[in-house]
Amino acid sequence: SEVEYRAEVGQNAYLPCFYTPAAPGNLVPVCWGKGACPVFECGNVVLRTDERDVNYWTSRYWLNGDFRKGDVSLTIENVTLADSGIYCCRIQIPGIMNDEKFNLKLVIKPAKVTPAPTRQRDFTAAFPRMLTTRGHGPAETQTLGSLPDINLTQISTLANELRDSRLANDLRDSGATIRIG
């Protein structure tokens, strides 16, 4: 059965997935897709990495952790009820049928009604919408703005709110972790 993760409408969702690369330059391709993991690849791909780069991602999906160390946990920005469902993290280990597949269930709850939003909860400002970005070069005009501005305080605050009391250490024990090499 899938491990369940929760987030509120308008906030950011966090779906953990980890592996341990042999070295920072010897990465394993990973794909994230909406829907349960199929036999091969990912359906409805929202983000993909290869042996070196994050080479594809779509507007609200990005990696919060250091993928060079195998932290390929997915962040979904500014979630809506439509983001509910199963997500597949597939670690594409070379060889026939060697892939590790993790199905994670995301449950989106209606936003809590609060009297007046504080600056820290101004999620539209904190997490502006992004244009769809495909694998691109390193030039500033191509990369600047492709990912939301977010500081560590916000990450920490959001993590506490969004992980439904699940500690970071618990995440690594939740099953979505594999050691490579």
């Epitope: 990005w62 060079r68 962040t75």
Partner: antibody, heavy 121, light 107 residues
Framework: QVQLQESGPGLVKPSETLSLTCTVS??????????WNWIRQPPGKGLEWIGY???????NYNPSLKSRVTISLDTSKNQFSLKLSSVTAADTAVYYC?????????????WGQGTLVTVSS | EIVLTQSPATLSLSPGERATLSCRAS??????LAWYQQKPGQAPRLLIY???NRATGIPARFSGSGSGTDFTLTISSLEPEDFAVYYC?????????FGQGTKLEIK
């Protein structure tokens, strides 16, 4: 336009610790996907990658320097720092901070102007 | 780690001429090679990434080619501001490494 600026002492005594700071301006410091690197260049020689820190705080160092290097982050000041311990004359170099992005890992698109650090007694 | 060898160490040419700089890797780096330009007292500037892609704002006279172990940076017609030191850098294997540089000087 992203700008990086190194700062720190220009002279360090042998066996002491070299400490440098890179200040980032222009908006990309706290963005996911960006890696913040230190690279050095001994006088008249080529460039050597020292290590990086990701905005989450994750670090990675060149194996040749790993035992002596620490890179840290201060998001409140848009700064990241380098500490290199037990320095010798061989550590005399221009030290650069530079940025790369996870869509083109290890391709350094923005650099600071560099700061010369001399190790001498 | 991968060793990058650049040649020649120094290249003397005149403005308007064509410059061809070479970078050879000790093992294949596929197309994961970048070129940087460095002028005296300045930081390196990214020119070419992934062997043949020009970085933003780089003039069309700069072009890169090659794959595997042999790479070339070509400047089709030298401008006075092109005289500098040029470095290649690979990102195929960790850690990333740089060549020792080619100094392009005015003849």
């Amino acid at each position: 336009q992203v700008q990086l600026q190194e700062s720190g002492p220009g002279l360090v005594k042998p066996s002491e610790t070299l400490s440098l700071t890179c200040t980032v301006s222009g908006g990309s410091f706290s963005r996911g996907g960006y890696y913040w690197n230190w690279i050095r260049q001994p006088p008249g020689k080529g460039l050597e990658w020292i290590g990086y820190i990701y905005y989450s705080g994750s670090t990675n160092y060149n194996p040749s320097l790993k035992s002596r290097v620490t890179i840290s982050l201060d998001t409140s000041k848009n700064q990241f720092s380098l500490k290199l311990s037990s320095v010798t004359a061989a550590d005399t170099a221009v030290y650069y901070c530079a940025r790369d992005h996870y869509s083109s890992s290890w391709t350094f698109d923005y650099w600071g102007q560099g700061t010369l650090v001399t190790v001498s007694s | 780690e991968i060793v990058l060898t650049q040649s020649p160490a120094t290249l003397s040419l005149s403005p308007g001429e064509r410059a061809t700089l070479s970078c050879r890797a000790s093992q294949s780096v596929s197309s994961y090679l970048a070129w940087y330009q460095q002028k005296p007292g300045q930081a390196p500037r990214l020119l070419i990434y992934d062997a043949s892609n020009r970085a933003t704002g780089i003039p069309a006279r700069f072009s890169g080619s090659g794959s595997g172990t042999d790479f070339t940076l070509t400047i089709s017609s030298l401008e006075p501001e092109d005289f500098a030191v040029y470095y290649c850098q690979q990102r195929s294997n960790w850690p990333p490494t740089f060549g020792q540089g080619t100094k392009l000087e005015i003849k």
